[in-house]
């Protein structure tokens, strides 16, 4: 699958959105008739690709959104598509990768000014442990960049996931970023689709590990929108 390509040791610890979404490619995404969105992921490769059908964004992986893959935007056929990176065109916040939101039709970074007024709201979403809210994001990985030091272990200071050892990602802990473990199968992964909400994460989580994506836990499908539990699940 695409996810295993992205998270394999060939591209060490390359998380979405660095390598695009962990899930399903969106080389031609159209959220509205007549608007064609070119693929936002230069690392995307298709390997026995199986599209994941969806009706809403919450049914897709953390770094995906739900839309029609065709130019016509036929609402009857929707699948999970790769989130859109910074400076790419968008129609709604869910289309943008973690750390970004949709502003004036473009995915832009959630800047630090979003933090102050909405801290309490974020904390209340917490499950109450160190890695308790919201999924992590990280920056582009420069594959050719020099190895300037040994990769960071859990708790080490980082700026992007390539600073961390294999099996770890770079995610916020309060107001700084540290290396945290990539999530394993069955572990809780929180999804959020509020404007700029990726920028509010006090305790970011890593993305789901190889071969996994963040989806609604099956027995929680009937629960209310606000309380549905997402976990890392096999494709």
């Amino acid at each position: 699958t695409l996810n295993s390509v992205l998270n394999s040791n060939a591209i060490k610890n390359l998380p979405p959105p660095l390598g695009g979404a962990a899930g399903h490619p969106g080389s031609a995404v159209s959220a509205a008739p007549g608007i064609l969105y070119p693929g936002g992921n230069k690392y995307q490769t298709i390997d026995n690709y199986q599209p994941y059908p969806c009706a809403e964004d919450e049914e897709c992986g953390t770094d995906e959104y739900c839309a029609s893959p065709t130019r016509g935007g036929d609402a009857g056929v929707q699948i999970c598509l790769a989130c859109r990176k910074r400076r790419k065109r968008c129609m709604r916040h869910a289309m943008c990768c973690p750390g970004n939101y949709c502003k004036n039709g473009i995915c832009v970074s959630s800047d630090q000014n979003h933090f102050r007024g909405e801290i309490e709201e974020t904390i209340t979403e917490s499950f109450g442990n160190d890695h308790s809210t919201l999924d992590g994001y990280s920056r582009r990985t420069t594959l050719s960049s020099k190895m300037y030091h040994t990769k960071g272990q859990e708790g080490s200071v980082c700026l992007r996931s390539s600073d961390c050892a294999s099996g770890l990602c770079c995610a916020r802990h309060f107001w700084s970023k540290i290396c945290k473990p990539v999530l394993k199968e069955g572990q809780v992964c929180t999804k959020h689709r509020r404007k700029g909400s990726h920028g509010l994460e006090i305790f970011q989580r890593c993305y789901c590990g190889e071969g996994l994506s963040c989806r609604i836990q099956k027995d929680h499908h009937q629960a209310s929108n606000s309380s549905r539990l997402h976990t890392c699940q096999r494709h």
Partner: antibody, heavy 117, light 107 residues
């Protein structure tokens, strides 16, 4: 009010070690990484490394590995940098600086280290 | 490691003039550039942080722009109190790297 108070100037002999302290107040110490920066006599700045007090995790600039060791004392909200095997090239001003979402927003007043026989 | 090249090294400007300082990075750093002011005997002061965000309490005559590898810091109408050294700092990747600094003086 956020404050970073650094220890006083140090005069040390070549080959010796020195510890510089950075006592913090006005914020929750464990919530921000602490960076250390070297400024060579009014010239440019160099990042030495950073330590996150939550688990004591560090990251160093390769250039300062073996030269600097970063630690924290959570009970006193104090960060510490030890510099060892000092030479004249280490004679300069060192700053601690608090991390805020990637930027270094509050800085200590600086500690001058002079290495002299 | 990302190298940050800052220019000019020194600048002599008249009061009221527009000041422009440039930093170029060796790798694409998105908009993860910060700008500092340092006066003699003082630590650096953060003026503008990632995303060209003016820090609270910093006068609006200071601004910055840029994305990717090319960044510009501007003082719209220079005042005597702006005499200082100015540094850029990239915070996209470790190790953090600073520009070489610009010494701003009054003409």
């Amino acid at each position: 009010e956020v404050q970073l108070q650094q220890s006083g100037p140090e005069l040390v002999k070549p080959g010796a070690s020195v510890k510089i302290f950075c006592k913090t107040s006005g914020y929750t110490f464990t919530e921000n990484t602490m960076h250390w920066v070297k400024q060579t006599h009014g010239k440019s700045l160099e990042w030495i490394g950073g330590i996150n007090p939550h688990k004591g995790g560090t990251s160093y600039n390769q250039k300062f590995k073996g030269k600097a060791t970063l630690t924290v004392d959570k009970s006193s909200s104090t960060a510490c940098m030890e510099l060892r095997s000092l030479t004249s090239e280490d004679s300069t001003v060192y700053y601690c600086a608090r991390d805020w979402l990637g930027a270094m927003d509050y800085w200590g007043q600086g500690t001058s280290v002079t290495v002299s026989p | 490691e990302t190298t940050v090249t800052q220019s000019p090294a020194s600048l002599s400007m008249a009061i009221g003039e527009k000041v422009t300082i440039r930093c170029i990075t060796s790798t694409d750093i998105d908009d993860d550039m910060n700008w500092y002011q340092q006066k003699p005997g003082e630590p650096p002061k953060l003026l503008i942080s990632e995303g060209n965000t003016l820090r609270p309490g910093v006068p609006s005559r200071f601004s910055s722009s840029g994305y990717g590898t090319d960044f510009v810091f501007t003082i719209e109408n220079m005042l005597s109190e702006d005499v200082a050294d100015y540094y850029c700092l990239q915070s996209d990747n470790l190790p953090y790297t600073f520009g070489g600094g610009t010494k701003l003086e009054i003409k």
